[in-house]
């Protein structure tokens, strides 16, 4: 009879990770008598997979039933494969002896290679906000890929962006991969409800794309443009000063009256109106009795936004002219601030 | 199902001869190593020989020179020929396959009596 | 010869009693060893081989464990069908050998 050869038909196997793997093996001869073995690896290192003679092996079960001594059928199939598992297979006859078994033949071996899913796509932005014009960085990282080929986009609004770096790791051979790309996003102040997205396409995805998003109404600040009118009110001896807090983003601001630079009033945002671009308008107001006052008031809305340095603007209340003559006759949304008399 | 059926067993002068037959059936004889078991009444077990699929053949000391055992796939027979038989060769044989992968004994015929003596 | 040496030679128990049958070599046998159950008049039947597979058909109250040259054959649960003899036998090595015996009897 001819001497036992030990048949792997397959060169390499492609698995999905999840699944299960499929290791074909087979003898061409029941002689000799001895034990089957899978090796993950070749030489003393090897890894071992499954033994017929002895062993728990919960992930592994055989093709056929290898108890019988008329079986030259040695596959095994590995159930849950993770990206951990990929590697040359070999499958090993022993022949029985004494005192250990020796190892008589081995396969050519089958490569396993596990297709591995990205994981969602996670953007992050800047730790702290920044203003219009100004640049941010966005990062985009994926783990746990197989095989390393990708590809990643990014994209502002649908539109595709082309300033950004990414990286594969690591650069050698690897059971799993992860990238890690960096994009740079110039801000504008209409970039409140914009959204930057970070694609990844991966051969496991079968052309669905994974995403990953940020919203830029975490990143930019949009600081306040104000303004401050005066108009007459019903009473011939009392001005309506009003500060119009606009375009401002986001809400978290404080605004403080100062009459001749003593505090007159603070108060918080609170019934904003928002606009179009999601950023925010806030009106307050002040009635002044400009009887009280023998000298010219100068009146100062100063307004602290997202914690940053306060920014404010003047409007100075000649009290020596009739009040229907001062400032602009601009009619302004009343938003419901408390009235202040100035005595 | 695996059967294992022996027969051929009796009385037998010492010095005499006798040939056990093994008939096999439920299984593909030819990929199967099979053995010969004895037992004298009353005591254990004694391995008394075993061929291999290659048709290789193993005896221990006790009956080696004495005992051939052979085997015709396309019969699916297996055979023990006893020559210059003993006293002491008085027992039940039995025919077993050897059914495991590592050649572990895994089905027994009923046995035939084989007794020697005068 | 490798010699096989079972312990107790015989052993009264009792219905649902767990009992342990020990099996000795004379040198290491590297596992290839199996357990047989025979009752009178009977063939031998195979219990457990390469020292703790169980054998097909075989309910799981029958336990084989041990390596090198001590092995061990446990019986969980005694049921009155499991009285019987049993052998230890050695295949690793022609000329194959088994054991004397146990004779397992109800007390």
């Known amino acids: 009879e001819e001497e036992l050869q030990v048949i792997q038909p397959d060169k390499s196997v492609l698995v999905a990770a999840g699944e299960t793997a499929t290791l074909r093996c087979t003898a061409t001869s029941l002689i000799p008598v001895g034990p089957i073995q899978w090796f993950r690896g070749a030489g003393p290192g090897r890894e071992l997979i499954y033994n017929q003679k002895e062993g728990h092996f919960p992930r592994v079960t055989t093709v056929s039933d290898l108890t019988k001594r008329n079986n030259m059928d040695f596959s095994i199939r590995i159930g849950n494969i993770t990206p951990a598992d990929a590697g040359t297979y070999y499958c090993v006859k022993f022949r029985k002896g004494s005192p250990d078994d020796v190892e008589f033949k081995s396969g050519a071996g089958t490569e396993l290679s596990v297709r591995a899913k990205p994981s969602a796509p996670v953007v992050s932005g800047p730790a702290a906000r920044a203003t219009p014009q100004h640049t941010v960085s966005f990062t985009c990282e994926s783990h746990g890929f197989s095989p390393r080929d990708i590809t990643l986009k990014w994209f502002k609004n649908g539109n595709e962006l082309s300033d950004f770096q990414t990286n594969v790791d690591p650069v050698g051979e690897s059971v799993s991969y992860s990238i890690h790309s960096t994009a740079k996003v110039v801000l504008t102040r209409e970039d409140v409800h914009s959204q930057v997205i970070c694609e990844v396409a991966h051969v496991t995805l079968q052309g669905d794309p994974l995403r990953g998003t940020a919203n830029l109404s975490e990143t930019i600040r949009v600081p306040p443009t104000l303004e401050v009118t005066q108009q007459p009110v019903r009473a011939e001896n009392q001005v309506n000063v009003t500060c119009q807090v606009r375009k401002f983003y986001p809400q978290r601001l404080q605004l403080t009256w100062l009459e001749n630079g003593n505090v007159s009033r603070t108060e918080t945002a609170s019934t904003v109106t928002e606009n179009k671009d999601g950023t925010y308008n806030w009106m307050s107001w002040l009635l002044v009795n400009v009887s009280a006052h023998r000298d010219d008031v100068k009146l100062t809305c100063q307004v602290e936004h997202d914690g940053q340095p306060a920014v404010s603007k003047s409007h100075d209340l000649k009290v020596s002219a009739h009040p229907k003559e001062q400032g602009s006759n601009t009619a302004a949304e009343n938003t419901g601030s408390n009235e202040r008399n100035i005595y | 199902e695996v059967q294992l059926v022996e027969s051929g067993g009796g009385l037998v002068q010492p010095g005499g001869s006798l040939r056990l037959s093994c008939a096999a059936s439920?299984?593909?004889?030819?990929?199967?190593?099979m053995d010969w078991v004895r037992q004298a009444t009353g005591k254990g077990l004694e391995w008394v020989s075993g061929?291999?699929?290659?048709?290789?053949?193993y005896y221990p000391d006790s009956v080696k020179g004495r005992f051939t055992i052979s085997r015709e796939n396309a019969k699916n027979s297996l055979y023990l020929q006893m020559n210059s038989l003993r006293p002491g060769d008085t027992a039940v044989y039995y025919c077993?396959?050897?059914?495991?992968?590592?050649?572990?004994?895994?089905?027994w015929g009923q046995g035939t009596l084989v007794t020697v003596s005068s | 010869d490798i010699q096989m040496t079972q312990s107790p030679s015989s052993l009264s128990a009792s219905v649902g009693d767990r009992v342990t049958i020990t099996c000795r070599a004379s040198?290491?046998?590297?596992?290839?060893l199996a357990w047989f159950q025979q009752k009178p008049g009977r063939a031998p039947k195979s219990l457990i081989y390469?020292?703790?597979r169980l054998q097909s058909g075989v309910p799981s109250k029958f336990s084989g464990s041990g390596s090198g040259t001590d092995f061990t054959l446990t019986i969980s649960s005694l049921q009155p069908e499991d009285f019987a003899t049993y052998y230890c036998?050695?295949?690793?090595?022609?000329?194959?050998?088994f054991g004397q015996g146990t004779r397992l009897e109800i007390k």
């Open positions: 077993a396959r050897g059914g495991g992968w590592d050649g572990s004994l895994d089905y």
């Open positions: 439920g299984f593909t004889f030819r990929s199967y190593d």
């Open positions: 061929i291999g699929i290659a048709g290789d053949t």
């Open positions: 040198q290491d046998i590297n596992n290839y």
């Open positions: 390469t020292a703790s």
């Open positions: 036998q050695q295949y690793n090595t022609y000329p194959y050998t």
